[in-house]
C-alpha cells in the first residue's frame, strides 16, 4: 500500500532496514556507524552547496523472534515484516537502504509499489537484475558472469592463446551469500554463462572435485569455485593435480592478496584468483576497525549508499525538483558519484561497476601477481603481465579440453 514519505519541507529521512538475516554476519552497530559517518559527509556536502536542509536516518529493526537463522534463508518474510512495520508506523523515508539478501530484496520488490528507491549492499542474485528502482553497491552475479565469458573467449593474449568453452563448477551448498548467488548464476541453465559454454557440469561433492583433479577422462581442465585460499585447501589439501588443470577461485571481497607480506601457499600454484581491485582502505574510520576485508566492503556499501542518496538529493534540490516522485526513484543509475573510497560508477541498471583483477601465483617469487584487469563498465579485459611466471607449461594457460594444447 502507499505509505506517506518523510521526505519534504527541508527534512529528508533515510529508512535503513537493520535485518537479523544479512548477506554478511556483521554486527548491526558497525552498519549504524557506517550510516552515521555517511550522514555527516552528506550534511557537509549539502551545506557546501548552500542547501539548508536536514538529513537523518531511521534504523528499522526486526524483532528477531521468528526470523533468527542469522543468514539469508529466512530473510524473505523478515523483509516484508519490516516493510509492514514501516507502513503501520507511517515512517517511510525518501529511500530504503537494505536489505542485502537476494531472497528478501526480490520479494520486497515484487510485493510493494515501489515509488521510492531501494539501495542494497548485496542482493547478488540474477533475480535482482534489471530492477528499475533497485541499486546494488556490491558486485552482482551478472558482472562476474560477463567477466568469465569474456575471459573464456579470449584467445589473443601471450598467456592465453585458446578460447575456452567448457568448465566444471564446484558448489557444495555451504557457500557464503555472495558465493551462493555467484555460483547459482553459473549453474543456471538459462544464464548467459551456460548459454555461451558448450560443456558445464556442477560438482556438488568434495570427492567429485578431488577425483577430477587427476581424472584422465575429465571433460574440462577448468574448475570454478568461490571462497578463500583456506576453503580451497580444506577441499584440495596437498593432493596431486594434473598439470593442465586451472582452478578459478572467485574471492571478490578480499584484498589480503595485495598485502606486502603475503606469500602464496604451494597449493595455490594451479589457481587464478579473481578479486576486486584493492583500495577499500577504511583504516582510519571509526566504524571499520577490526573488520575483516569482506565486512569492510559490506560496511563501505552502506556508507556509499548514504553518499549516493546525498548525491541525488543535492542534484534534485539544486534543480528545484520534487523528491517524492517516480523520477527520483528511477534516477539512481547511470552515474558516477564520489564515494568514501573514490569514485563509484553505477551502470544503466543501478549496479555498481568495478575493476576485477585476476591474480596468479608466481613460481619465482611465490607472490600473487596481477595477470589482467577487467573493467565491468565497458566489459573489457586489460592484460597486465605479458610474460607471467606460471606453473603451466610454456607459461601459457592450457587448453580447456585435455588432449589439446600444452599438457
Amino acid at each position: 500500500s502507499q505509505v506517506s514519505q518523510n521526505c519534504h519541507n527541508g527534512s529528508y529521512e533515510i529508512s535503513v532496514l537493520m535485518m537479523g538475516n544479512s548477506a554478511f554476519a556483521e554486527p548491526l552497530k558497525n552498519l549504524e556507524d557506517a550510516v552515521n559517518e555517511g550522514l555527516e559527509i552528506v550534511r557537509g556536502r549539502l551545506q557546501n552547496a548552500g542547501l539548508n536542509v536536514t538529513v537523518n536516518a531511521t534504523f528499522m529493526y526486526s524483532d528477531g523472534l521468528i526470523h533468527n537463522s542469522g543468514d539469508c534463508r529466512s530473510s524473505t518474510c523478515e523483509g516484508l515484516d519490516l516493510l509492514r512495520k514501516i507502513s503501520n508506523a507511517q515512517r517511510m523515508g525518501c529511500v530504503l537502504i537494505g536489505p542485502s539478501c537476494t531472497y528478501s530484496t526480490f520479494q520486497m520488490y515484487l510485493d510493494t509499489e515501489l515509488s521510492y528507491p531501494m539501495i542494497s549492499a548485496g542482493s547478488f542474485g540474477l533475480s535482482c537484475d534489471y530492477k528499475e528502482t533497485l541499486t546494488r553497491l556490491m558486485s552482482p552475479a551478472r558482472k562476474l558472469m560477463y567477466f568469465l565469458v569474456n575471459f573464456w573467449k579470449t584467445n589473443d593474449l601471450p598467456f592465453k592463446t585458446y578460447s575456452w568453452s567448457t568448465s566444471y563448477v564446484y558448489k557444495n551448498g555451504t557457500e557464503t551469500e555472495d558465493c551462493f548467488w555467484y555460483l547459482n548464476a553459473l549453474e543456471a541453465s538459462v544464464s548467459y554463462f551456460s548459454h555461451e559454454l558448450g560443456f558445464k557440469v556442477v560438482l556438488r561433492q568434495d570427492k567429485e572435485f578431488q577425483d577430477i583433479l587427476m581424472d584422465h577422462n575429465r571433460k574440462s581442465n577448468v574448475i570454478i569455485m568461490c571462497g578463500g585460499p583456506e576453503f580451497l585447501y580444506k577441499l584440495k589439501g596437498d593432493r596431486a593435480v594434473a598439470e593442465d588443470i586451472v582452478i578459478i577461485l572467485v574471492d571478490l571481497f578480499n584484498d589480503q592478496y595485495f598485502e606486502d607480506n603475503v606469500t602464496a601457499p604451494d597449493y595455490m600454484k594451479n589457481v587464478l584468483v579473481l578479486t576486486l581491485s584493492p583500495g577499500n582502505s577504511l583504516l582510519n574510520s571509526s566504524f571499520s576497525r577490526n573488520l575483516s576485508p569482506t565486512k569492510r566492503d559490506f560496511a563501505l556499501a552502506y556508507l556509499n549508499g548514504i553518499l549516493l542518496f546525498g548525491h541525488m538529493l543535492k542534484i534534485f534540490l539544486e534543480n528545484g525538483e520534487n523528491i517524492t516522485t517516480p523520477k527520483f526513484a528511477h534516477a539512481f543509475r547511470n552515474l558516477t558519484f564520489e564515494g568514501y573510497d573514490g569514485p563509484v560508477t553505477l551502470d544503466d541498471w543501478g549496479d555498481v561497476d568495478s575493476t576485477m583483477v585476476l591474480l596468479y601465483t608466481s613460481v619465482d617469487t611465490k607472490k600473487y601477481k596481477v595477470l589482467l584487469t577487467y573493467d565491468t563498465h565497458v566489459n573489457k579485459t586489460y592484460p597486465v603481465d605479458m610474460s607471467p611466471t606460471f606453473t603451466w607449461k610454456n607459461s601459457k594457460l592450457p587448453n580447456d579440453i585435455t588432449g589439446r594444447g600444452p599438457q
Epitope: 559527509i41 557537509g44 556536502r45 557546501n48 577504511l282 582510519n284 564520489e338
Partner: nanobody, 119 residues
Framework: QVQLVESGGGVVQPGGSLRLSCAAS????????MDWYRQAPGKQREMVAT???????TYTDAVQGRFTISRDNAKNTVYLQMNNLKPEDTAVYYC?????????????WGQGTQVTVSS
Amino acid sequence: QVQLVESGGGVVQPGGSLRLSCAASSNIFRAYGMDWYRQAPGKQREMVATIWLSGRSTYTDAVQGRFTISRDNAKNTVYLQMNNLKPEDTAVYYCNAGPTTASSVRQYWGQGTQVTVSS
C-alpha cells in the same frame, strides 16, 4: 566561505625533500577527497595525487614512489611529502578541493605554492 591555504614550498636541490601543506575549511575537508595539482612554466596544469575520505590515495606515474599524500583529520589539513625531488618537479603546486565540476576538477583552488628544484 571556503578557504584553501597552501604552504611549504621553496627551493631545494635535486634529491632533496619538501613537505607541502593545505589547510582547508572543515566543511570541505570532511565532505570530499582532495587533490594536489601542479603547473610548470609553459605547461598545462596536471594532477599529482588524490586522497579520498577513507585515506586511500592515488598518484600520477611521474611521482609514484616518491610523493606521499596524507590527511590529518584533526587539523583539516592535507600534506604532500615530496622526496627525491627532480628538476622536472619544479612547478607551482595547487591544492584542489570540493565537489567535482563538469570539467572534472574540484570546485575550489588554493593560491598555489612555488617549488623549485635546482642545483
